[in-house]
Interface confidence: medium
């Protein structure tokens, strides 16, 4: 079962863990008693669409809640372990109240206020670091984000966002805390194509589909203008005018040997004789320059069974 937590006297809104993209109605129950939770807003705990609302939450609300999604051919049940904690007396936020850590490494970085999208909130969100209100101009609250300019290791710590949830003319406070750590500074490096090798020849079968992946690494961290792309006879794929040959939309990002890499895949739906005479160039480029590996296609030799 999934876990959710909140603080006493604050609003807590949770979603059914089974819901996925379902639009079917959701019913909520107290798991231990099987008692149905009402939808009437006059109750302190009530159901609204797929959400269960505690307005406000109390320590005694802690327990396991069941949600059932009723669809014509299948009922799905999910369980949610809800824990309501008393507000910590000191500034030290215990681990069990912390949301996932955010890792920053760039000159500008943002921290998102966790779970805020579940609530009916209005700006501004207030932000605190280690319980102190953030007032330096370097810290900018915008929508559900906190932007930090010129991040340094001194900015590491626990960041708490506080906002107001409005329901039925009443305002409820919500606070959420997450840690922020600063990774080592990223760097940009001249690109290197790790695959395919330089002047590589690839074997293909006429009439069959073929795909060639090109991977290049650029450095670590932010890569402004880094890209991997394919050219056919020195023409970008989109302008080549051959519908059978397409460059896959988007770039797969990965990390290889502590370095950030991009992969672009060239797909040929059905290889023709003409394709064997073309030159396929994989280009990797960033602010530091460009590197090119040329690939050719060759007909796969049939296996000699003599």
């Amino acid at each position: 079962s999934k876990s959710s937590w909140g603080l006493e006297n604050e609003a807590l809104i949770v979603r059914c863990p089974q819901r996925g993209r379902s639009t079917y109605p959701v019913e909520w129950y107290y798991s231990d008693t099987n008692e149905s939770i009402p939808t009437q807003k006059r109750n302190r705990i009530f159901v609204s669409r797929d959400r269960l609302k505690f307005l406000p939450a109390r320590v005694e609300d802690s327990g396991i809640y069941a949600c059932v999604i009723r669809s014509p051919n299948l009922n799905k049940t999910g369980y949610l372990n809800v824990t309501i904690h008393k507000k910590p007396p000191s500034c030290n936020i215990p681990d069990y109240l912390m949301y996932s850590t955010v890792r920053g490494s760039d000159k500008n970085f943002k921290i998102t206020c966790p779970t805020i999208d579940l609530y009916n909130w209005t700006a501004p969100v207030q932000w605190f670091k280690n319980c102190k209100a953030l007032q330096e101009p370097r810290f900018r609250a915008h929508r559900s984000y906190l932007f930090i300019d010129n991040v340094t290791h001194d900015d590491e710590g626990d960041y708490t966002c506080q906002f107001t949830h409005a329901e039925n003319g009443t305002n409820y406070i919500v606070t959420a805390t997450r840690s922020f750590t600063v990774e080592e500074k990223g760097f940009s490096m001249f690109p290197v194509i790790t695959n395919p090798p330089y002047n590589h020849t690839m074997e293909v079968e006429i009439g069959k589909p073929a795909s060639i992946a090109c991977s290049a690494c650029f450095g670590k961290g932010s890569h402004f203008l880094a890209d991997v792309l394919w050219q056919i006879n020195k023409t970008v794929v989109g302008n080549f005018g051959e519908a059978r040959i397409q460059e896959e939309e988007g770039r797969n990002e990965s990390s290889s040997n502590d370095m950030d890499c991009l992969t672009s895949v060239l797909r040929i739906t059905g290889v023709t004789e003409k394709d064997l005479s073309l030159e396929y160039d994989c280009l990797a480029l960033n602010l530091h320059g460009m590197i090119r590996h040329t690939i050719r296609l060759r007909r796969k030799q049939p296996i000699d069974h003599r």
């Epitope: 001249f190 090798p197 040997n257 502590d258 320059g289 590197i291």
Partner: antibody
């Protein structure tokens, strides 16, 4: 055959200038980053500079930044290193090297000797 | 800058010996490591790139291993032509840096 051939080394006084050349053959020159690496007498290897395939980007070791300029002429398949304000500590064998797979120097020239002395 | 340290700085070995040279980077460089052999008066020659990939034409008695900060070059059975100085090099970031070298001579 893939080959790199340096020239232009010699004896020069401190504060003087020298231009090294490296003629490349046997490969598509513009497809590769090219580099200068030096080795002082009895010492280890020291990377000096790198230039991208079309010369749009250059990198330098701190020890030569502002004094040395790397350039290339792809029509002549030639790499250059313009060395100004030379110091005694620039005395070394200068190698031209091609940057290959995984940014390793896969092809090296035979080297040209630069001596900075009064 | 990333510092590269090599050990030993020199070693004496006999033909047929198994020789191991280690290189340590001052920070993690993944597998962005190369090894070179240099003989007196000659240019360096690439042996290994990407920490463990043997350069074309290099005898299989040479092998490389390691990732992160610790790397090893191994010569499984030393041959007369292997007496030389060996350098490691990181290409993870600029400035590209080399180790100080390990001289392998005849015992």
């Amino acid at each position: 055959e893939v080959q790199l051939l340096e020239s232009g080394g010699g004896l020069v006084q401190p504060g003087g200038s020298l231009r090294l050349s490296c003629a490349a053959s046997g490969f598509t020159f513009s497809d590769y980053y090219m580099n200068w690496v030096r080795q002082a007498p009895g010492k280890g290897l020291e990377w000096v500079s790198t230039i991208s395939g079309f010369g749009e980007s250059t990198f330098y070791a701190d020890s030569v930044k502002g004094r040395f300029t790397i350039s290339r002429d792809n029509s002549k398949n030639t790499l250059y290193l313009q060395m100004n304000s030379l110091r005694a500590e620039d005395t070394a064998v200068y190698y031209c090297a091609r940057l290959g797979a995984a940014r390793a120097f896969d092809i090296w020239g035979q080297g040209t000797t630069v001596t900075v002395s009064s | 800058d990333i510092q590269m340290t090599q050990s030993p700085s020199s070693l004496s070995a006999s033909v047929g010996d198994r020789v191991t040279i280690t290189c340590r980077a001052s920070q993690s460089i993944g597998s962005w490591m190369a090894w070179y052999q240099q003989k007196p008066g000659k240019a360096p020659k690439l042996l290994i790139y990407a920490a463990s990939t043997l350069q074309s034409g290099v005898p299989s008695r040479f092998s490389g291993s390691g990732s992160g900060t610790d790397f090893t070059l191994t010569i499984s059975s030393l041959q007369p032509e292997d007496f030389a100085t060996y350098y490691c090099q990181q290409s993870y970031t600029t400035p590209i840096t080399f180790g100080p070298g390990t001289k392998v001579d005849i015992k």
